[in-house]
């Protein structure tokens, strides 16, 4: 079974541009999590979904960040407008 699939693997953008990250969770998993990791702040949980419903988005209080999960097999994390301090590794994870 394929693991969690994210795209793009790398993204370079100019400040102020919109960035959209995509995630396909493991089939049959009903919880999906978006994390951000930086050297300065460590690993931060941004938002998680259960059965496609956002449960806790308190890790992204800036309304530049928005996440959606329109169905059980797809989620997006959007940053609009992006800022230099958004530079990080963004992880998607899923679980039963």
């Amino acid at each position: 079974d394929a693991g969690v699939i994210q795209s793009p693997r790398h993204e370079v953008t100019e400040m102020g541009q919109e960035v959209t990250l995509r995630c396909k969770p493991i089939s049959g998993h009903n919880s999906l999590f978006w994390y951000r990791q930086t050297m300065m702040r460590g690993l931060e949980l941004l938002i998680y979904f259960n059965n496609n419903v956002p449960i806790d988005d308190s890790g992204m209080p800036e309304d530049r960040f928005s996440a959606k999960m329109p169905n059980a097999s797809f989620s997006t994390l959007k940053i609009q407008p992006s800022e230099p301090r958004d530079s990080a590794v963004y992880f998607c994870a899923s679980s039963l």
Epitope: S58, G59, P61
Partner: antibody, heavy 117, light 106 residues
């Protein structure tokens, strides 16, 4: 009914410290981000700090970084603000507020901090 | 930091008047949020995501705008509406407030 009750304010000398508390009830505290906001006498609102539900994401007003520390204890349904090296300009009513509707949907009644010699 | 400037800072009006308060951001924001505060009381959320009324807020309040300029409108002032109003942005930390608009009885 959502309730937020601040405590810990009082009179403190310049250079001193205080720890404010915010006791939450009427909602699942561990599911919500929380803010501190302050209001100096006769002045407007000033955002102070934010902490996410699991304490992983924390933000501070630039002018307060290094002196103020936000924290929470989800087992006690309580939010804290540790304030060190207090100055006269920190004199204000300090409010805690719940993050909801993308904003601050519930506020406490406030606790007064006075920094004076 | 994104500076929010409200205008006017003071506004005198009468019961039944239509009033508009403007909030201008030094940098573009995605949404604006509005609060009402009465003397000696905590602020109360009025409008979120620019135009959505918070639960229990009367329909005479409305919000609109985009980019750098947003407005709060009260269609017909009631006695209980005389208070100070603040806008706030959450697009980028720090989450700044406007300086406030004090609405007084004429």
């Amino acid at each position: 009914e959502v309730q937020l009750v601040e405590s810990g304010g009082g009179l403190v000398q310049p250079g001193g410290s205080l720890r404010l508390s915010c006791a939450a009830s009427g909602f699942t505290f561990s599911n919500f981000g929380m803010h501190w906001v302050r209001q100096a006498p006769g002045k407007g609102l000033e955002w102070v700090s934010y902490i996410s539900s699991g304490s992983q994401t924390i933000y501070y007003a630039d002018t307060l970084k290094g002196r103020f520390t936000i924290s929470r204890d989800n087992s006690k349904n309580t939010l804290y603000l540790q304030m060190n090296s207090l100055r006269a300009e920190d004199t204000a009513v300090y409010y805690c507020a719940r993050r909801g509707e993308g904003a601050m949907d519930y506020w406490g009644q406030g606790t007064t901090v006075t920094v004076s010699s | 930091d994104n500076q929010l400037t409200q205008s006017p800072s003071f506004l005198s009006a009468s019961v039944g008047d239509r009033v508009t308060i403007t909030c201008r951001a030094s940098s573009s924001v995605n949404y604006i949020y509005w609060y009402q505060q009465k003397p000696g009381k905590a602020p109360k959320l009025l409008i979120y995501y620019t135009s959505n009324l918070a639960p229990g807020v009367p329909s005479r309040f409305s919000g609109s705008g985009s980019g750098n300029e947003y407005t709060l409108t009260i269609s017909s002032l009631q006695p209980e509406d005389f208070a100070t109003y603040y806008c706030q942005q959450f697009t980028s930390s720090p989450f700044t407030f406007g300086q406030g608009t004090k609405l007084e009885i004429k």
